[in-house]
Amino acid sequence: GRLVHMTVVSGSNVTLNISESLPENYKQLTWFYTFDQKIVEWDSGKSKYFESKFKGRVRLDPQSGALYISKVQKEDNSTYVMRVLKKDGYEQEWKIKLQVLDPVPKPVIKIEKREDVDDNCYLKLSCVIPGESVNYTWYGELPKEIQNSVLETTLKPHKHSRCYTCQVSNSVSSKNGTFCFSPPCTAARSEQKLISEEDLGGEQKLISEEDLHHHHHH
């Protein structure tokens, strides 16, 4: 059978369906979870919903064969199989591999290092989120786009503040964290701060291992 991939955000309502029309006047139609767990079967004009973790949150549309699942969770990750028994005795199968992802959490920007190096300022920031498989992109006044969790840059002496935004994303959501840095490089009370929640549309966090009490948190 054909295999289709679907990625959705947890908590959403999902429609599992095939892109082609069902065989005409089919005899029976069954949806399976992980190949052998029956969810629902249609036959003789009625849908039979079986005891499973889906009972009460699925609905079958016999016309299209679509299976509606409400409030999907990560535990619903699986290959779903739609099996159709045709009037001539043949069976046809379609498979949908469903990946349910949580929205990415808000990133924490951590100052790993900042020091004077030959009158320039060396800055190392890391963008941290708990145990997720995500993509990272840093934006700001950078020589090139950086696509990992750590940003290392050397700043020439400057008067104005520099801001760096870390964007974490998976295929269903993305969140930003922005860190602004003002000279001098290692002054005890240097102004390093995060753009506020209102500016970014979400609470951001900053953690610095050194001089933690000097940093302004929002």
Epitope: K27, Q28, T30
Partner: antibody, heavy 121, light 107 residues
Amino acid sequence: QVQLVQSGAEVKKPGAAVKVSCKASGYTFTAYGISWVRQAPGQGLEWMGWISAYDGDTNNAQKFQGRVTMTTDTSSSTAYMELRSLGSDDTAVYYCARDRYSSSSGYFDYWGQGTLVTVSS
Amino acid sequence: DIQMTQSPSSVSASVGDRVTITCRASQDISSWLAWSQQKPGKAPKALIYAASSLQSGVPSRFSGSGSGTDFTLTISSLQPEDFATYYCQQANSFPYTFGQGTKLEIK
């Protein structure tokens, strides 16, 4: 894994009745139908009837009409086949077999190990 | 009732041989046909359904073909464990009926 475990061998007198059980495990019992098939010594297979474990709907071969009763107990995931008015030609191994669908498709994917019923005076 | 007739009723073959068993229905059953294998003292085992679909776990040396009234079970290269009796069965209509069986013996 899917298993159908049947009750043990029985010896019955002519005119008596026998009730064979088939306990299912490893799958959602109500999501499949059960057929009963028998095999007389040295003979071929003979379909007796079918029951839906979902709603108890049945269909029996005309030959056994009025003499066979098929039931299920969903709480114990067990199917039963009772055959009454036994004669010597009912001596056979009786098998339960799982249908691929909750309504009968006639396609069996798993079989019980069989129950030998001997009818002898 | 639909009658199912298998041929031959028995066949002798050697390991590695290609074997074909045929089954004929007394009326058109489209593709509503299954094949099963039975060894002495054991329950039947499902091999093929819908004329040509292999049951899960069945080796690919087994194949089925046909539709309407004429059907074939083929074992491409016989293995020692394949010596058994094979039954065809129609699933087109109640009552389901079986062929009389084909006994596959070692030559």
